[in-house]
């Protein structure tokens, strides 16, 4: 049995066009072999029509392709302008035609709406283009070519071959003579309107012998795709508007009281503020079509929403759109989480990210919402031990607590880490959770050293000072690399006299490096944590040099450099290229978890969520 | 709540026919693609026939194990999809499962992948007998 799968039977109409997926192994041979479409001859052979080498087929010429996509295991054949010849059966294919590795597809291509009592029936979408085409005899070509409308009883000139145009189609319409050889004229709308329907009648010639064809026209107002989503999770609106207004302005707007419509976001760099940090536009394909992904879906974000083309990047008559109506579930799946975290300069915060619990062994993401342009979402650390450079020593993706959550700590915080921060992963497309991170007044919690350096050989003991707040947390040191943060062994050395107005709760706890060497070089935090639920970190950077002078080294905070300020982001890190999140499977469905404990008085990093979305705090 | 009912099962002699529907409702409930999978004792889930859709475009995916005994058709309105059971043999006995997906997935989905439907019927059992 040839493992290549495709659609066993295909039905269309005339003018239609067909896009058939066929599935093949992934191996790396069948990723990078030639694939083919080809028709079954009565005899056994099948003629290709087209291949992923380039090659079309006169038959197929402008109006077929086909796109291989490696990754997915898939390749896709487009045919445009079905006509009842393309009825038969075929195959998709790769390799050779002849040597099996394809399978059988049948194409039936019917009889679109034709002629009725010699009417030719257009249908078309509203804002699209409509090509009527009016017969004529040789007797006839000399002369005047013209379109009427049928307005009540009276037929009302549109176009003609003299050059004139009726005012309520300017701009928007030509007429077509075709070559001598062809004895045929045809009308071209573009930005059909709904008011465009009705009855048309195409001349060629003005007495009695004129050659006359009737058209009615239906332009067909698109109905709403209907659209079910929870309360906090995510819906992508996929907009396919067609080639022809692939280099026009795209927008999705909401339609408000009567036929207003507001944007929501366009390619023109309009955004809704209600949408700031929950909203891409991904990048349109070559075709025009595009897509737009709403995140911490509200019960306000219900309604009917437009796609569209034109030129201003909102709904204009004549605009082509899709449409659709949103449903906000309110008895959601998904758990309320926290949807601001506020954290101080120079500390940290830990944020929880839900996530579908059935997808434990999915990659986790987080990723870093930037306004400009049309959205996107550049990656910023992910499970599979990847960080972005300018993140190392104080970004770290953590599975625990697991079963449904994970864990994103950013420490060494400054004002530009205010912002909004999605939590994705590769499994589902449905739930997808927005953070947005602040930045506020206030000092950090734990305090150590600044940047610290050892000496090869020798005892380095670096402190963290934990105020008495964190009494009843559990205290760590950890050495921090792009899949983590390894626990290490640390000494509590009491109380800790770092703080004013603390009692005998606060605590001095040290890390105790022996034998220090090269090995040892690199980002250390200390932290508190609950169980698998993690509070504040704070980040020391420790360098080895060389022995100078024997001893152990003691660092204290006096001896240390200044926190972490600003300046840190600026020092020498290498730009990479950003990973931007386009692509929907990165998105994940996920199940967001609540956490009502408040972060250990919270003046470092506590949460504010608004309405009834209020918590406590986002780490602990 | 999206629903979807099966019907049509039961017991069926080796070499007959049987045909099974599966009804969508709910929430105004519009699929984009319905399809038909069975589970045989001890067995996995296995994808017999599924039918997608996109205005007045069809294709019909069949499963190699069923390939030109069994058809799968919808009707007009979209919400009922049909199983025409032909020449059943005895390892066609299963529980067959009603799918349905109401979003157009992306290209790289393969509709014989059970995970990638959203909802499920509970079940019709089909025995054939010899």
């Known amino acids: 049995k040839s493992p290549i799968f495709g659609p066993e039977e295909v039905n269309s109409v005339e003018g239609n066009s067909v896009s058939i997926t066929c599935y093949y192994p992934p191996t790396s041979v069948n990723r990078h072999t030639r694939k083919y479409w080809c028709r079954q001859g009565a005899r056994g052979g099948c003629i290709t029509l087209i291949s992923s080498e380039g090659y079309v087929s006169s038959k197929y010429a402008g109006r077929a392709n086909l796109t291989n996509f490696p990754e997915n295991g898939t390749f896709v054949v487009n045919i445009a302008q079905l006509s009842q010849d393309d009825s038969g059966r075929y195959k998709c294919g790769l390799g050779i035609n002849s040597r099996g590795l394809s399978f059988d597809v049948s194409l039936e291509v019917s009889q679109g709406p034709g002629l009725l009592n010699d009417t030719k029936v257009y249908t078309v979408d509203l804002g699209r283009t409509v090509t009527i085409n009016c017969p004529f005899k040789t007797e006839n070509a000399q002369k005047r070519k013209s379109l009427y409308k049928q307005i009540g009883l009276y037929p009302v000139l549109v176009i003609d071959s003299s050059g004139y145009v009726n005012p309520n189609y300017t701009g928007r319409i030509r007429l077509d003579i075709q070559g001598t050889g062809q004895l045929l004229f045809s009308v071209v709308i573009n930005q059909l309107r709904l008011s465009d329907a009705g009855q048309y009648l195409c001349q060629a010639g003005d007495d009695s012998n004129s050659n006359k064809k009737n058209a009615d026209l239906q332009v067909l107002k698109p109905e709403p795709e209907l659209v079910y989503e929870d309360l906090r999770g995510s819906v992508t609106f996929h907009c396919a508007l067609g080639p022809e207004v692939a280099n026009v302005a795209k927008f999705l707007c909401r339609q408000s009281s009567g036929e207003n419509c507001d944007v929501v976001v366009n390619t023109l760099g309009k955004r809704a503020p209600a949408f700031e940090g929950r909203i891409l536009l991904n990048p349109q394909d070559k075709d025009g079509s595009f897509s737009v992904v709403i995140t911490g879906l509200r019960k306000e974000d219900a309604g009917r929403y437009l796609c569209g083309a034109h030129s201003d990047g909102q709904l204009q008559e004549g605009s082509p759109i899709q449409a659709w109506q949103l449903f906000v579930n309110e008895e959601s799946t998904i758990p309320r989480s926290p949807t601001v975290v506020k954290g101080v300069a120079g500390g940290s915060v830990a944020v929880l990210c839900p996530y579908n619990r059935k997808e434990s062994k999915s990659i986790k993401y987080w990723c870093l919402w930037e306004g400009a342009q049309n959205g996107r979402c550049p990656l910023l650390v992910d499970s599979e031990g990847w960080v972005k450079a300018q993140y190392e020593g104080r970004l770290s993706l953590l599975e625990e607590p697991g079963n449904g959550t994970f864990t994103v700590i950013l420490n060494q915080l400054t004002s530009r880490d205010a912002g909004f921060y999605w939590c994705l992963t590769n499994g589902d497309t449905l739930w997808r959770t927005t953070v947005e991170i602040k930045i506020i007044e206030g000092e950090p919690n734990l305090k150590v050293p600044g940047n610290v350096t050892a000496v090869l050989g020798e005892t380095l003991k670096v402190p963290c000072h934990f105020p008495c707040k964190f009494s009843s947390y559990e205290k760590y040191w950890c050495k921090w690399n792009n899949t983590g943060c390894q626990a290490l062994p640390s000494q509590d050395e009491g109380p800790s006299k770092a703080f004013v107005n603390c009692d005998e709760n606060s605590r001095l706890v040290s890390l105790t490096l022996n034998l220090v060497t090269r090995a040892d070089e690199g980002w250390y935090w200390c932290g508190v944590k609950q169980g698998h639920f993690y509070g504040e970190t704070a980040a020391v950077y420790v360098a080895v040099e060389e022995r100078k002078a024997a001893g152990s080294r003691d660092v204290s905070l006096a001896k240390a450099d200044a926190a972490p300020d600003e300046k840190v982001l600026d020092s020498g890190f290498r730009e990479i290229e950003n990973k931007a999140i386009q692509d929907p499977r990165l998105f994940a469905e996920e199940k967001a978890v609540a956490d009502t404990r408040d972060q250990a008085d919270g003046s470092r990093a506590s949460v504010d969520s608004g309405s009834s979305e209020e918590q406590g705090g986002s780490s602990r | 709540q999206v629903q979807l009912v099966e019907s049509g099962g039961g017991l069926v002699q080796t070499g007959g026919s049987l045909r099974l529907s599966c009804a969508a409702s709910g929430r105004t409930f519009s699929p984009y693609a319905m399809g038909w999978f069975r589970q045989a004792p001890g067995k996995e889930r296995e994808f017999v026939a599924a039918?997608?859709?996109?205005?007045?475009?069809?294709?019909?995916y069949v499963g190699d194990s069923v390939q030109g005994r069994f058809t799968i058709s919808r009707d007009a309105a979209g919400n009922t999809v049909y199983l025409q059971m032909n020449s059943v043999k005895p390892e066609d006995t299963a529980v067959y499962y009603c799918a349905a997906d109401r979003v157009p997935k992306d290209i790289s989905i393969d509709p014989r992948n059970p995970k990638d439907w959203d909802y499920w019927g509970k079940g019709t059992l089909v025995t054939v007998s010899s």
């Open positions: 039918i997608r859709w996109s205005g007045a475009t069809t294709y019909k």
